[in-house]
Interface confidence: low
């Protein structure tokens, strides 16, 4: 003899991303010559056996046999969420419930609050916001490959009462190394299935210049031509270069952009030379010790701020 349970239909809960397709499958062992039926959370019949009951082109029959009724709902909306009921009209009527959960996909995050041309050691504060997630998404920050610790993600219900807007802020002190860095806000959510959904903000940092003196050739000898290149870096790039020689009347004349030229080296050129690179952010002086008596000059790894 068949037990009563053999006439009890069974189904399963389903999770679907908004816009996706969900398949609802209901099975029964003993149908007792009765048809299976699917109805929606509003108790509207969707299919009774192979007969369509609701005019909604998104709902299609997948399979209808005496032991199974499977339907698909395409382009699922948040409003489709709820308990779907599979019924078999035996005596008594038996039902099985399928809870359909619809995930809201978070929108691409928006970064606000960036103030252009930050100065070194100033604090940058950026805000990130993403709407449309269900359940609420999480936001994370990074600077290049480095994780930034933003504040806790704030959650606000969207006007539709179903999805959420999440937001987070991050503050950090900028350094010269951050010039040109990308600050990335990423949204993490189960609907994305690991796919990256992020927005980046490139930041510019203004900082005092640095400079380095490079001799050309690297090992000049007496009688040779020597160029001392003053290579300035900074943001903005230094525009003014002034050369001095310790013990001499400043400044020395440049003959080629930022370079100091010695057409014909002699021993009297020996000494320590300073190149001051200046931008509107400040000045920096690099030094170089030239000893023409030796076969090669001895550079001094040197610098000063002003």
């Amino acid at each position: 003899n068949l037990s009563q349970d053999d006439s009890q239909p069974w189904t399963s809960d389903e999770t679907v991303v908004a816009g996706g397709t969900v398949v609802l499958k209901c099975q029964v062992k003993d149908h007792e010559d009765s048809s299976l039926q699917w109805s929606n959370p509003a108790q509207q019949t969707l299919y009774f056996g192979e007969k369509r009951a609701l005019r909604d082109n998104r709902i299609q029959l997948v399979s209808s046999t005496p032991h199974e009724l499977s339907i698909s709902i395409s382009n699922v909306a948040l409003a489709d969420e709820g308990e779907y009921t599979c019924s078999i009209f035996t005596m008594p009527v038996r039902t099985a419930k399928s809870l359909v959960t619809v995930l809201g996909i978070p929108q691409k995050p928006i970064i606000t609050g960036y103030k252009s041309s930050l100065r070194e050691k100033e604090t940058a504060t950026l805000n990130c916001q993403s709407s449309g997630s269900k359940p609420a998404a999480q936001l994370t920050w990074r600077k290049g490959d480095q994780e930034l610790h933003g504040d806790q993600t704030r959650i606000q219900e969207d006007p539709n009462g179903k999805t959420f807007t999440v937001s987070s802020s991050v503050s950090f002190q900028v350094t010269r190394e951050d010039d040109g860095a990308n600050i990335v806000c990423s949204v993490n959510h189960e609907s994305l299935k690991g796919a990256d959904r992020s927005t980046s903000q490139r930041i510019e940092v203004l900082y005092t210049p640095t400079a380095m003196i490079r001799p050309e050739p690297a090992h000049p000898r007496e009688g040779q031509k020597l160029l001392l290149h003053c290579e300035g870096r900074g943001n903005p790039v230094p525009q003014q270069y002034v050369w001095v020689k310790e013990g001499s009347e400043p400044p020395l004349k440049m003959t080629q952009e930022s370079a100091l030229i010695f057409p014909f080296l002699n021993k009297s050129d020996s000494g320590t030379y300073g190149c001051t690179a200046t931008s509107n952010m400040g000045s920096y002086t690099a030094y170089f010790t030239l000893n023409v008596n030796d076969p090669s000059p001895v550079p001094s790894s040197s610098s000063t701020y002003h």
């Epitope: 610098s303 000063t304 701020y305």
Partner: nanobody, 124 residues
Amino acid sequence: QVQLVQSGGGLVQPGGSLRLSCAASGRTFSNYARGWFRQAPGKEREFVAAIDYSGGSTNYADSAKGRFTISRDNSKNTLYLQMNSLRAEDTAVYYCAAPASRRPSWDADGYDYWGQGTLVTVSS
């Protein structure tokens, strides 16, 4: 002439912290860069950290990055090295140093004046 007098060394357990100080006298301290070096038994003296005259620029050896902090108080003519998360391999004699001109250098050859050295022992 510059005199550099160090203090603050001693014995500390792994994971512990120490703060080294280096007081300068003689010439105006604030005009010049300062550096810390160390020499472990049987090894060469190695660069640890340096700071420029204004305190605006610092440089650290890879072994010190993230654990050590160099700073200076020009009003007190004093240089500091805060050492956190100390390891056994940090055991060494630590020296503060100053160059004869306003030129920060990450090479011991760039320094003309040296402190007397202070022993830091990291051991459980």
